[in-house]
């Protein structure tokens, strides 16, 4: 960056190089160039010469003043006009940053995705800080009182093998940057209660042409958890409102769920599961689209109806969606 250049003098910022966004700041430049009494001192921001709010303080020093500085990052340097020099002489440069102190981290959540071998902890970091902000995740065993700390810049994956202090823990998050530090409330967890079953996936759909056509959705999960509850939500793609069906599920075989849907309409389906009665749900699965067939026109010929019935006409779909929806709808 600009801070690596060789200086002939120095540049400094008041109140600091990293400051709260929206503050008034002063950038000072002091020349120390051999055989040069600067005629003029110039300031550059991101390579562009500043023309206003520059005050000469003395023979070697000038000040640039900014009101309500809102840029997250800027590279500043200053130059001198020396007598007998055709070009400006570089004095020094500095990278400056503005931003905000961190908000108190909230909505701290820790879950263990089945088979992952990790406890994943996330939180709502609050508003964007614009400056480098680090998070320390504290995990304290309620049985041994031992505390571990993990440094991260976003979420954290903690190997369950490293959680040797029993099943019950307190987890909290400290957020810190150059402008301040905040700490979340403590979350109490029990490792047995935060396991989220292996993802449920809709594999295919078919509409069977019976007297009343019905759509069968096939879905499965590789979970080994015995008591699993699931929700499947579905709607016409033109509709705003989801319909939700609930299931107590045994994943020893592929699930088949039946729906009586309107003909010739494109529907979207999603599924999610949880260990029955626990707090946390899987995120909703990828969007699965299925278009129901048009109604088979009524025909008077019994023979034709009989043939149609026997043909077991089906319309099948496979998953095409890759969008996922978060697990915060209905808390999750």
């Amino acid at each position: 960056g600009i801070t690596n250049i060789n200086c002939s003098g120095h540049i400094w910022v008041e109140p600091a190089t990293i400051f709260k966004m929206g503050m008034n700041i002063s950038i000072y430049c002091q020349a120390a160039i051999k055989n040069c009494q600067p005629r003029k001192l110039h300031f550059y921001k991101n390579g562009i010469k500043e023309r206003f709010q520059i005050t000469r303080i003395n023979k070697t020093t000038a000040r640039l003043w900014y009101k309500n500085f809102l840029e997250p990052h800027a590279s500043m340097y200053c130059t001198a006009e020396c007598p007998k020099h055709f070009q400006e002489t570089l004095i020094c440069g500095k990278d400056i940053s503005s931003g905000y102190p961190p908000d108190i981290p909230d909505e701290v959540t820790c879950v263990i995705y089945e088979y992952s071998g990790n406890m994943t902890c996330t939180w709502n970091a609050g508003k964007l800080t614009y400056i480098d902000t680090k998070y320390v995740v504290h995990v304290k065993s309620l049985e041994t009182e031992e505390e571990q700390q993990y440094l991260t810049s976003s979420y954290i994956n903690i190997s369950t093998d490293s959680l040797q202090g029993g099943k019950k823990y307190l987890v909290w998050v400290q957020a810190a940057n150059a402008l301040g530090m905040e700490e979340s409330k403590q979350l109490q967890i029990h490792l047995d209660d935060i396991v989220i079953p292996s993802a449920a996936v809709i594999s295919r759909a078919e509409t069977i042409n019976a007297t009343v056509p019905k759509t069968i959705i096939y879905w499965d999960s590789q979970t080994t958890i015995e008591k699993v509850s699931c929700e499947m939500r579905y709607k016409a793609t033109t509709n705003q409102t989801w319909n939700v069906k609930e299931f107590d599920t045994n994943f020893t075989y592929v699930q088949q769920s039946e729906f009586y849907l309107e003909p010739n309409i494109k529907y979207v389906f999603q599924v999610r599961c949880q260990e029955t009665g626990k707090r946390y749900w899987q995120p909703w699965s990828s969007l699965f689209f299925h278009k129901t067939p048009e109604t088979v026109p009524q025909v008077t010929s019994k023979a034709f109806q009989h043939d149609t019935w026997n043909s077991g006409l089906t319309v099948a779909s496979i998953s095409t969606g890759h969008l996922t929806s978060d697990n915060r709808g209905d808390i999750g």
Epitope: T241, G277, K278, R328, G329, D330, I331
Partner: antibody, heavy 117, light 107 residues
Framework: QVQLKESGPGLVQPSQSLSITCTVS????????VHWVRQSPGKGLEWLGV???????DYNAAFISRLSISKDNSKSQVFFKMNSLQADDTAIYYC???????????WGQGTTLTVSS | DIKMTQSPATLSVTPGDSVSLFCRAS??????LHWYQQKSHESPRLLIK???QSISGIPSRFSGSGSGTDFTLSINSVETEDFGMYFC?????????FGGGTKLEIK
């Protein structure tokens, strides 16, 4: 059939604590969460907290410092304790069942609490 | 916290009338909205889940609609047993919160 029944003291003095037991039948506490909700003329229905099918709990932040919920799965009982009661804690206290989705499909009949000296 | 506002506070109707009760959330809650009925001196009873899903054992004259912030509970041809309080509840974020209720009374 599914039933939840609260039993509480009826009258508690200010600054004292409240203990209510919710005894359930027709379902297992290892498969359902049990929530506590109170109802008063001044504040309407307020969600207080929940104990999930494991041992984890969640509390309304407004009550977290003085509330604790626990249970005994073998006795099908959930225990609610609230400390430092004041007159505005006077209400009907309900326990209610949820399956993991956060609505209440069965409620107890409620126990009326008056906080008064 | 998400604030749930119900309107009207009181609704006076004659048996046989069809009515609509309204619930508004202070921010979008998708369809994570549930309706309860509470008769005098009784505990609440779940009527509708997820804004529009019917509940086993609840008469078909009760229906729900809405998504986002605005929701409606409709009662098609009110019967005498329907009079009482109606509450909505959001389950989109902690803490779970209820509306202040609508009292359905006989005109």
């Amino acid at each position: 059939q599914v039933q939840l029944k609260e039993s509480g003291p009826g009258l508690v003095q200010p600054s004292q604590s409240l203990s209510i037991t919710c005894t359930v039948s027709g379902f297992s506490l290892t498969s359902y969460g049990v929530h506590w909700v109170r109802q008063s003329p001044g504040k309407g229905l307020e969600w207080l907290g929940v104990i999930w099918s494991g041992v984890s709990t969640d509390y309304n932040a407004a009550f977290i410092s003085r509330l604790s919920i626990s249970k005994d799965n073998s006795k099908s009982q959930v225990f609610f304790k609230m400390n430092s009661l004041q007159a505005d804690d006077t209400a009907i206290y309900y326990c209610a069942r949820s399956r993991g989705s956060y609505y209440f499909d069965y409620w107890g009949q409620g126990t009326t609490l008056t906080v008064s000296s | 916290d998400i604030k749930m506002t119900q309107s009207p506070a009181t609704l006076s109707v004659t048996p046989g009338d069809s009515v609509s009760l309204f619930c508004r959330a202070s921010q979008s809650i998708s369809n994570n909205l549930h309706w309860y009925q509470q008769k005098s001196h009784e505990s609440p009873r779940l009527l509708i889940k997820y804004a529009s899903q019917s509940i086993s054992g609840i008469p078909s004259r009760f229906s729900g609609s809405g998504s986002g912030t605005d929701f409606t509970l409709s009662i098609n041809s009110v019967e005498t047993e329907d009079f009482g309080m109606y509450f909505c509840q959001q389950s989109n974020s902690w803490p779970l919160t209820f509306g202040g209720g609508t009292k359905l009374e006989i005109k």
